[in-house]
Amino acid sequence: QVHLVESGGGVVQPGRSLRLSCAASGFKFRSYGMHWVRQAPGKGLEWVAIIWYDGSKRYYADSVKGRFTISRDNSKNTLYLQMSSLRAEDTAVYYCARDLITGTTDYWGQGTLVTVSS
Amino acid sequence: DVVMTQSPLSLPVTLGQPASISCRSSRSLVYSDGNTHLIWFQQRPGQSPRRLIYRVSNRVSGVPDRFSGSGSGTDFTLKISRVEAEDVGVYYCLQGAHWPYTFGQGTKLEIKR
């Protein structure tokens, strides 16, 4: 049974930093590219970032480039999103996901809410 | 970035009737491996998204066959042959052929009373 559980969300002031985690279980984590996708309250989905199975490549949405860093620890089966210089427009539910593009099944976590507010 | 434009943004449908959602991309979604990476997601109220269709027309395992995808190049369509109550939600297209990946704005499917 595949499980993705995000944590680390909360209320943070503009300009501050926050680190999200996604604990993976039930599959061979170190073989998969992993994504972060976010959804602002009442809005649509926005793809945020991907990291390669071995951590060697990372791609980001233009809106977070230079501020957010995706990383992973394959020994801990955990995906991370380090968010810095946070802005009000980063307020969203952040989902980690596997297999967005290929494969016969996709998997998403339940999401963690990040609120950027003074 | 590749812009994904969905229409309509809101879609009221009678139960048992067909529904069709369009998705247009600002560039061709044919990837270097020859595959066209247009994906459709469903997000029911209060739930995480789930993928319905990948590579334009391939149904994800467990997705009912009333959902079908079609299209090529820059024009794509998601069809629901007979809408059921559980199909209520927002439908998103996603392109996975160019970095960064980009979603359409979403189409809200509602049941007509």
Epitope: F27, K28, S31, Y32, W52, Y53, D54, G55, S56, K57 | -
Partner: antibody, heavy 124, light 111 residues
């Protein structure tokens, strides 16, 4: 194209150390992938020995863990196998290889690029 | 360790016919629907060459007459139609669980 080439001594004495080099051309070993050592014994049985990742971490076959070390020299684009001590049972053809990955971020722990292999005999 | 048992150990097939090689795993290598079984071809004096990865994905540049199938513990490599150049030894490999292990090989001869 990606090319891998093994080099090292053809003959090693029992209880000594075996050191092999894999020279990689056409791809930087720090750019990604797992860089793997595999050996094939007389009689053709294949054994996965271990790998080093693009960022220098390791994963070894538990049966060899006490004797094996895989390291690298990023400036020379080479990675190395050290087996210490060796016995006659380590006589084999040693291959270096690279793992398969797709364009979507996924890896498969299969090997698509291999060196030609180097034959090692352990004998006094 | 996961043991992979290949059968037959050798087979002789006529040109144009079908060759079928079986690989049985001592436990399931089906990790959430992803089958970590791979197939290689090895000719004398050469390193193994990847044919199929993840049970059924054809490696780039490999002819479509090579197909892989199976799930759980039972996997098959089919070659059809067999050509002269297919004479070689074929190995399956699992990477579902460390250590990665290989089957004992199947030697294919062309009649």
């Amino acid at each position: 194209d990606v090319l891998l080439q093994e080099s090292g001594p053809g003959l090693v004495k029992p209880s000594q150390s075996l050191s092999l080099t894999c020279s990689v051309t056409g791809y930087s070993i720090t750019s990604g992938h797992y860089w793997i050592w595999i050996r094939q014994f007389p009689g053709n049985k294949l054994e996965w020995m271990g790998y080093i990742t693009y960022d220098g971490s390791n994963n070894y076959n538990p049966s060899l863990k006490k004797r094996i070390s895989i390291t690298r020299d990023t400036s020379e684009n080479q990675f190395f196998l050290k087996l210490n001590p060796v016995t006659t049972e380590d006589t084999a053809t040693y291959y270096c290889a690279r793992d398969v990955a797709d364009s979507y971020g996924n890896g498969y722990d299969a090997m698509d690029y291999w060196g030609q292999g180097t034959s090692v005999t352990v004998s006094s | 360790d996961i043991v992979l048992t290949q059968s037959p150990a050798s087979l002789a097939v006529s040109l144009g016919q079908r060759a079928t090689i079986s690989c049985k795993a001592s436990q399931s290598v089906d990790y959430d629907g992803d089958n970590y079984i791979h197939w290689y071809q090895q000719k004398p004096g050469q390193p193994p060459k990847l044919l199929i990865y993840a049970a059924s994905n054809l490696e780039s540049g490999i002819p479509a007459r090579f197909t892989g199938s199976g799930s759980g513990t039972d996997f098959t490599l089919n070659i059809h139609p067999v050509e002269e150049e297919d004479a070689a030894t074929y190995y399956c490999q699992q990477s579902d669980e460390d250590p990665w292990t290989f089957g004992g090989g199947t030697k294919l001869e062309i009649k």
